[in-house]
């Protein structure tokens, strides 16, 4: 469909208007002007950027640009009293320390503030003893020490690699198997790629290189002091006691040089197998304790950081909908970042920068969107999502009438291989389309659409001929838009090829040599990937605010919840003989899917044919599309997880960034065959499969016709 | 109720491969190491290698390396051992074993290799 | 690898007496032993882990000691069914190594 569709709209006003607007040597400046002095939420320097932003979108032509401010928890490290861990001897004494803060990286040795590496929220704490290596500290890690190694992590100090999940369910798993204390480091394993350099002769990590990352377990809660509410003026705080989501022992992380240092003493048992040894010259002994000579050495951990209830600043910019004001497409990233975020968050907001102006540009020419935008610069992401989900609390009423659609953007780039979308299947036939009608960057692609390149690259493994589009989880700012307010949401990145490239994110991630320089020298010296991502990101916003008939397709989630139903069925059926035993159907389940599976398809031919010149027709049937995500949310919200109330997506319980579909069946079944009163777990899973089967019946009466 | 049941005897020619299978049940199959153990007639045990056969990771002793395979298969909860190029000497028992501490123990197989 | 010795190698023992069987690591292994009853014909069964832990069902006749490199099992009184060749296995690294065991008999 053609997009010149709204009001005193002139025909080179369009899509393709914007998207040429849209120029690297652009993105770039943004991205030099972000990160040449660090970012960190709550900080002076942070405060300023909010404020040149807010500029500079007003300069661009936003119609208005406000700061919403949030007092929240937020947690630094005690300047006169840094953390670190020791190897003590039998005296007590010191015979080890681990480094203080990352050798700064060139041109940078006289930066200040720059905050050395700590783990948001930890506890302070001097615990000691002996070490337990617990692999990356995942669910069935803990599994594998505790049932079939019969390895007890009571007591003890584990030391976790960093990757395939959550820090924060690592500290968790820590805690629930009893540990106290948590040293967490960056295997090379995972962050160092074979034949590249480490930094600052290429993009890996070297050995002083420290990921810094807040562990809290906050299942969208915000504010750890104000959960569902927003932390303003006149808030009433939690104590620290109460407390959301702070973990109960102390967190360190370290780099590999050090890591080393910790684990070459290792003696216990052997490792289980290949899957628990990484690239150093140790031999990944899992303890507990130290091996022989060193057996009476044990390790210390001095953590001094505070908890501080901090002020901080989200951008919120406003281009106004010339025919649906009251509609809002919303476009947001962070902004704060751990040292000079020069792929997190700002690849990101440089692209939203450049988004903002383009937008702007084409309305100085008189052109606006049909819907309004939403334009946010959010504060405090890296300490748990606080300035989305606190602004989100404070406009829940509006957004939860008014929210067509959310766009994330975090880093723009995670690699430079191929494109990597995750979303709301809602959104599905608007990327294909999209990407479709926007030239690859790729090389040996030359003259190919994006489509092709990244379905060649990433091909989806159920339908061929169309590419990966993966499952929303959390770890960014969408989380309370989708997984809280039920907004359809979605998020696009340039990453690497996950097929040779098995290290966890990129290797620099969250450490000080994420500089301007690693992005500008080897990761999109051209910039053409980060304009693609702007492209995409910023193509998804024009359509969503100013197509006529909103560019979401419920029959692709029909296709979704047959496939998650078939799936999570598939899990339960692995207990013929207790599901016999406690009489367990999925056929109400099945039943709702075939229902919203015939209604969606009939919505889809009323949406074909209806009079797109009648406004209230119009509007009627937008409005289904809009609220058929809402549709999914539950009030009552997932078993001890209240403010994760999308019934068919959720972050995983073991591992936040991961979604999980139809997560409340998905609960109630792990581990069941554990559990000490089956009765009681298989009724569980029934009522989960009760409240599935009735929310994708109820949300498949939404799209039937109104009367 | 742990069980083990391992796949009958074997009789093989010098230079061929023996594949043992090990069915298990009565615990979660992914939770468990499975070892691979062998004992030749009056001799001590030799541990060959071992698998987590939730995401099949091994390790396998180095006397063994490039003639030993262990796999396994999840929707069936058995293990496999694979021995090729065999030699008179690997005339043994071949005992699989569930548990990083060999907690439960398969009842042999019998491999006889002779020309 | 790690070499694990056990002595004696064989052991006869009059029922209701003690058998203290020995096994010594060739370097420290810490308390990363595991023991082993294995009777006639029969695959072997797990007695001990972690040096001195029991395993479910075992009776508490029998014990495990040690660490670093020296292990004991003791069986405090020895009845009819104990007879059975032993053997101690490390786990602190790889290959995982097994004693050559030791056979205990009734005198």
């Known amino acids: 469909k053609s997009s010149n569709e709204a009001t005193n709209i002139t025909p080179k006003h369009n899509m393709k208007a914007f998207l040429d607007e849209l120029k690297a040597e652009n993105i770039k400046k943004f991205l030099y002007n972000f990160t040449q002095i660090p970012h960190l939420a709550g900080t002076e320097q942070n405060f300023q950027l909010a404020k040149q932003i807010q500029s500079q979108w007003k300069e661009f032509g936003l119609d208005s640009v406000e700061l919403a401010h949030y007092d929240v928890l937020l947690s630094y490290p005690n300047k006169t009293h840094p953390n670190y861990i020791s190897i003590i001897n039998e005296d007590g004494n010191e015979i080890f320390n681990t480094s203080l803060f990352e050798p700064p990286p060139p041109g940078y040795e006289n930066v200040s503030d720059i905050v050395p590496p700590f783990s948001a929220f930890s506890p302070q704490g001097m615990p000691e003893g002996d070490l337990v290596y617990v692999n990356y500290a995942r669910t069935e890690d803990f599994f594998k020490l505790e049932r079939d190694m019969k390895i007890n992590c009571s007591g003890k100090i584990v030391i976790a690699r960093y990757g395939k999940v959550f820090r924060g369910n690592k500290v968790k798993n820590a805690q629930l198997a009893g540990a106290k204390g948590v040293i967490l480091y960056s295997d090379p394993a995972d962050y160092f790629a074979p034949g590249v350099k480490s930094y600052p002769d290429g993009w890996n990590l070297p050995g002083g290189g420290v990921q810094r990352g807040n562990i809290l377990n906050l299942n969208g809660a915000g504010d750890p002091l104000t959960p569902g509410y927003p932390a303003n003026e006149y808030a009433y705080r939690r104590g620290i006691a109460e407390a959301v989501g702070l973990p109960s022992i102390p967190v360190h992380p370290i780099g590999y040089y050090d890591a080393q240092k910790l684990l070459e003493k290792m003696g216990g048992s052997a490792p289980p197998d290949s899957s628990w040894r990484g690239s150093l010259k140790v031999p990944y002994n899992v303890g507990p304790g130290f091996t022989g000579n060193f057996s009476t050495q044990k390790v210390k951990m001095h953590i001094h950081s505070t908890n501080e209830v901090t002020r901080i600043y989200n951008v919120i910019g406003t281009l106004r909908g010339a025919v649906e004001p009251d509609r809002y497409v919303i476009l947001g990233g962070h902004r704060d970042s751990w040292v000079f975020g020069g792929i997190d968050p700002q690849s990101g907001a440089a692209v939203v920068h450049e988004i903002v102006r383009s937008f702007g540009t084409l309305k100085k020419e008189g052109w606006r969107p049909r819907r309004t935008i939403l334009f946010a610069s959010w504060d405090a992401e890296e300490f748990g999502l606080l300035g989305s989900t606190e602004w989100a609390e404070e406009n829940s009423r509006l957004l939860q009438e008014r929210g067509v659609a959310y766009i994330n953007a975090d880093s723009s780039i995670e690699g430079n291989y191929t494109l990597r979308v995750d979303c709301t299947p809602l959104m599905y036939s608007l990327v294909h389309n999209l990407t479709k009608e926007l030239k690859s960057p790729d090389e040996g692609f030359e003259g190919k659409s994006l489509y092709e390149s990244w379905t060649k690259k990433s091909p989806s493994p159920e339908f061929s001929g169309m590419p990966r589009i993966s499952k929303l989880g959390s770890g960014n700012d969408f989380e309370v838009f989708f997984q809280r307010l039920g907004i359809a949401s979605g998020r696009a990145r340039y990453t690497k090829n996950w097929e040779t490239n098995k290290f966890s994110g990129y290797p620099l991630y969250h450490s000080v040599y994420e500089t301007y320089e690693l992005v500008e020298k080897f990761y999109d010296p051209m910039f053409k990937y980060h304009l693609t991502v702007a492209q995409v990101r910023g193509g998804m916003v024009f359509e969503l605010a100013n197509s006529i008939v909103l560019p979401f397709d419920c029959r692709d989630y029909a296709v979704v919840l047959r496939k998650y139903a078939d799936k999570i069925y598939s899990i339960s059926m692995k207990h013929p003989q207790e599901m016999k035993t406690y009489s367990v159907s999925f056929d109400s389940l099945f039943s709702a899917v075939k229902n919203f599976t015939e209604i969606a398809s009939k919505f889809s031919e009323r949406l074909q044919d209806f009079d797109k010149s009648n406004p209230i027709v119009l509007r009627m049937m937008n409005d289904q599309l809009m609220f058929l995500e809402r549709a999914f949310i539950d009030p009552l919200g997932l078993p001890d997880r209240p403010f994760y109330r999308h019934v068919i997506y959720a972050p995983s319980s073991h591992n936040k960034y991961a979604g999980e579909s139809f997560p409340g069946i998905y609960d109630a079944l792990f581990d069941i065959e554990s559990k000490v009163d089956p009765s009681k777990a298989w009724g569980e899973v029934k009522r989960q499969i009760y409240v599935a089967a009735f929310t994708v019946q109820a949300a498949a009466e939404t799209l039937s016709e109104v009367a | 109720e742990v069980q083990l049941v391992q796949s009958g005897a074997e009789v093989k020619k010098p230079g061929a491969s023996v594949k043992v299978s090990c069915k298990t049940s009565?615990?979660?199959?992914?939770?468990?190491?499975i070892h691979w153990v062998r004992q030749a007639p009056g001799q001590s045990l030799e541990w060959m290698g071992n698998?987590?056969?939730?995401?099949?990771?091994?390790t396998y002793n180095q006397k063994f390396q490039g003639r030993v395979t262990i796999t396994v298969d999840k929707s069936t909860s058995t293990a496999y051992m694979e021995l090729s190029s065999l030699r008179s000497e690997d005339t043994a028992v071949y005992y699989c074993?569930?548990?990083?501490?060999?907690?439960?123990w398969g009842q042999g197989t019998l491999v006889t290799v002779s020309s | 690898d790690i070499v694990m010795t056990q002595s004696p190698d064989s052991l006869a023992v009059s029922l209701g007496e003690r058998a203290t069987l020995s096994c010594r690591a060739s370097?420290?292994?810490?308390?990363?032993v595991d023991w082993y009853q294995q009777k006639p014909d029969q695959s072997p069964k797990l007695l001990i882990y972690?040096?001195?832990t029991r395993h479910t069902g075992v009776p508490d006749r029998f014990t495990g000691s040690g660490s670093g490199t020296d292990f004991t099992l003791t069986i405090s009184s020895l009845q009819a069914e104990d007879v059975a060749v032993y053997f101690c296995?490390?786990?602190?690294?790889?290959?995982?190594?097994f004693g050559a065991g030791t056979k205990v008999e009734i005198k």
């Open positions: 296995q490390q786990i602190n690294s790889y290959p995982l190594t």
């Open positions: 009565g615990y979660t199959f992914t939770e468990y190491t």
């Open positions: 698998i987590n056969p939730n995401n099949g990771g091994t």
């Open positions: 074993a569930a548990g990083w501490n060999f907690d439960y």
């Open positions: 972690w040096a001195s």
């Open positions: 370097q420290d292994v810490g308390t990363a």
